[in-house]
């Protein structure tokens, strides 16, 4: 039995993170066969903590491989019958100590989780479980309590309507009080600690002892092919029971004897030194949250699970978080709902993972008269004035940039700036200077448009200003229609798809 | 060997009520989420609806089309999965499978339900 | 919901041949495709989970392949008791989705 680094898995890892002494708890937790790991439903047979734990002290150069583990069992009692079928959840724990570690601190290293079929009162039960880098030997088996026996610990109490009315000498039966306990199944003498019975008047070993009422320990010293150890004066005491004394093979397997020791042919379901270990097949259901069971079609085979999306673990039943890949682009918000991911774009993104974006060319254009550019692969807006911005919805201040030349006044428009020119120059942005002695403008203004005729230049000039601000106001009311109509489509999109996530996320 | 068997199909007039009734042997039926799918005349496949486990507080889960009008029920002691339909519509005519899992493995041979005046 | 498209609606072939059958999704789906058999008066069968991977039983001239939108069911030789429509579903996003089905009938 051990806790430590999986072969192959490099350097062996200390438990305790180089912060000092640690030790380490296992945390065992019984589930009815249905129970799924991922609902973290109750231990409804049971659960248990080890106890008196070895400190593990960190050494430079330190193999991890072999961790000091708890002395002892750890006894899970459970109520009622034993269902056979029951999911066994192992947790180890790791408390730092010592006061730079800040007082004790708890943390979870590793969690195995599989669905198991045991028959109560058989042998140990071996088994190696792997999580993460993390490898975990351990055994375990169930045993009956009084007066319960048998593979499924079935009371054999006598039903009565009161305890008051158990006859002489009999005591109300546990945990059915309404019951009295019937009188002593086994073999009279067959030991309560190391032996056990299906039958009236039988007594069958567990692993490790033998003998006709199961109170002589096997040996596994150089006593084992001379049989039963004696004092440690005497040597070893001949004869003594044989390898198939006791019958150390479990769940009805027949045991032969070969020289010196004992094999055991093992009935369809189980298998194992001792046939111990049962068989799961996939028509018993052993991969969680729905998982696909392949191969194990008998109980000699492996089982594989197929899991579905957001699970994983040999038995499915390890939740993903999927949204920690990051999935949704563009800064889309993530929802894991179990069997679906939903990505909840950002304005101007859509698709399933926001991969689509809404402001290119192709889609929805730049706002408030600004025209799309693109080219590299990517798109830019060039702004109408007045505005600004990525997608040109912000209002800028046309006048900030002082657009008008040669002390030119700016004036801001609602369709953008009007320049007034200072004495001496003309034109949109002031650009133009006029010769006072009324020779040509420079650079020269169209013919017909000479200072000398200053009334006819500034009645050019307004009708060239009114029809641009009418081809913008034309223009912006076309796209700010156009823009509405496309917005609707995808606020309706993005409505319904927001009305599923919420049923979904309800469901 | 696995075997799902329904029950319960038959003809039904528009608005009226049916259950089926689906019974599995060879599997450990609480361990498995169980599903409905059904088959119209000539048509593809079509998943109705979902019944998960004990532990997931027997959780279920609906398309779209039959939301509101049918409901999944199971009872792990008699190994049964229970369809109930009501108000039942004329497109709702077709074979219904029970099936197991998320992938739909084990599947039962149907019964055919029709829904006419 | 994810649509699948599958195509062509029916191939006709002999024994002996290759059959190619098309699936198309509306989205990415990864590899959670799952291909189903289904014979005249029977209940579907599962062939092929995962996009590529054969289930329990299922012989080895059935094959499955693609990722994302496109995906292959390959049956490398007929026997005459493969003749049958086949179906393709999604298991990606809840609820799974089936496409319309292919018939592959003898020619």
């Known amino acids: 039995h051990s806790f430590g680094p999986g072969p192959g898995l490099g350097t062996p890892r200390s438990p305790c993170n180089a912060r000092g002494p640690c030790r380490l708890f296992f945390r065992v937790c019984l589930k009815p066969g249905v129970s799924q790991e991922a609902t973290e439903s109750l231990c409804a047979l049971g659960a248990a903590l080890s106890t008196s734990v070895p400190v593990y002290t960190e050494h430079p150069g330190e193999s991890a491989a072999a961790l000091p583990l708890p002395d002892g069992l750890v006894r899970v009692p459970f109520r009622d019958a034993w269902p056979g079928t029951f999911s066994l959840v192992i947790e180890t724990w790791r408390e730092q100590l010592g006061e730079h570690a800040g007082g004790p601190a708890w943390n979870l290293l590793a969690r195995v989780v599989g669905r198991r079929r045991l028959a109560a009162g058989g042998p140990w039960a071996r088994d190696v479980q792997r999580t993460g880098t993390w490898e975990l030997h351990f055994s375990y088996r169930a045993r009956c309590e009084p007066p319960a026996v048998g593979a499924a610990c079935a009371r054999l109490c006598r039903s009565r309507s009161a305890p008051s009315r158990c006859g002489p000498g009999l005591r109300p039966c546990t945990p059915f009080p309404d019951e009295c306990e019937a009188p002593s199944v086994c073999r009279p003498g067959c030991s309560p600690e190391h032996g056990y019975c299906e039958e009236p008047d039988e007594c069958r070993c567990l692993e490790g002892w033998t003998g006709p009422l199961c109170t002589v320990p096997v040996s596994t010293s150089s006593c084992l092919n001379s049989r039963v150890p004696g004092p440690a004066s005497t040597g070893c005491l001949l004869p003594g029971p044989g390898p198939c004394d006791g019958n150390p093979c479990a769940n009805g397997g027949s045991c032969s004897e070969t020289s010196g020791s004992f094999e055991c042919a093992c009935p369809r379901g189980f298998y194992g030194l001792r046939c111990e270990v049962s068989g799961v097949t996939c028509a018993d259901g052993p991969c969680f949250n729905g998982g696909l069971c392949v191969g194990g079609e008998d109980p000699d085979s492996a089982y594989v699970c197929h899991c579905p999306p957001g699970f994983q673990g040999s038995n499915c039943e390890k939740r993903v978080d999927r949204c920690s890949l990051q999935p949704c682009q563009n800064g889309g918000l993530c929802l894991d709902l179990g069997h679906a991911l939903r990505c909840r774009c950002r304005a101007g993104f859509a698709g399933p993972r926001c991969e689509h974006d809404l402001d290119d060319c192709a889609g929805r254009a730049c706002a408030n008269g600004g025209t799309c550019v693109e080219g590299g692969g990517s798109r830019r807006c060039s702004c109408a004035l007045g505005f600004g911005g990525r997608d040109c919805r912000e209002r800028a201040d046309p006048c900030a940039s002082r657009p008008c030349a040669h002390g030119g006044r700016c004036y801001a428009h609602f369709s953008g700036l009007v320049c007034a020119c200072a004495p001496g120059y003309m034109g949109v942005r002031c650009e133009f200077a006029v010769r006072p002695d009324g020779a040509d403008a420079v650079p020269a203004a169209p013919r017909g448009l000479r200072q000398a005729d200053p009334q006819r230049f500034l009645a050019g000039v307004i009708a060239v200003i009114v029809v641009v601000v009418i081809a913008i106001v034309a223009g912006i009311v076309v796209l700010v229609i156009s823009r509405k109509k496309r917005m609707a489509k995808y606020e309706k999109a993005e409505i319904k798809e927001m009305g599923e996530m919420h049923r979904e996320l309800n469901a | 060997e696995v075997q799902l068997v329904e029950s319960g199909g038959g003809l039904v007039k528009p608005g009226g009520s049916l259950r089926l009734s689906c019974a599995a042997s060879?599997?450990?039926?609480?361990?498995?989420?169980m599903n409905w799918v059904r088959q119209a005349p000539g048509k593809g496949l079509e998943w109705v609806g979902q019944i998960r486990l004990k532990s997931e507080d027997y959780a279920t889960h609906y398309a779209e089309s039959v939301k509101g009008r049918f409901t999944i029920s199971r009872e792990d002691s008699k190994n049964t999965v229970y369809l109930q339909m009501n108000s039942l519509k004329t497109e709702d005519t077709a074979v219904y499978y029970c099936t197991t899992g998320y992938y739909f493995d084990y599947w039962g041979q149907g019964t055919t339900v029709t829904v006419s005046s | 919901n994810i649509v699948l498209t599958q195509s062509p609606a029916t191939l006709s072939l002999s024994p002996g041949e290759r059959a190619t059958l098309s699936c198309k999704a509306s989205?990415?789906?990864?590899?959670?495709v799952s291909w189903f058999q289904q014979k005249p008066g029977q209940s579907p069968r599962l062939l092929i989970y995962?996009?590529?991977n054969r289930y329990t039983g299922i012989p080895a001239r059935f094959s499955g392949s693609g990722s994302g939108t496109d995906f292959t069911l390959t049956i490398s030789s007929l026997e005459p008791e493969d003749f049958a429509v086949y179906y393709c579903?999604?298991?990606?996003?809840?609820?799974?989705?089936f496409g319309g089905g292919t018939k592959v009938e003898i020619k």
């Open positions: 995962g996009a590529s």
């Open positions: 989205e990415n789906v990864g590899t959670y």
């Open positions: 060879g599997i450990t039926f609480s361990n498995f989420w």
């Open positions: 579903g999604q298991f990606y996003s809840f609820p799974s989705t």
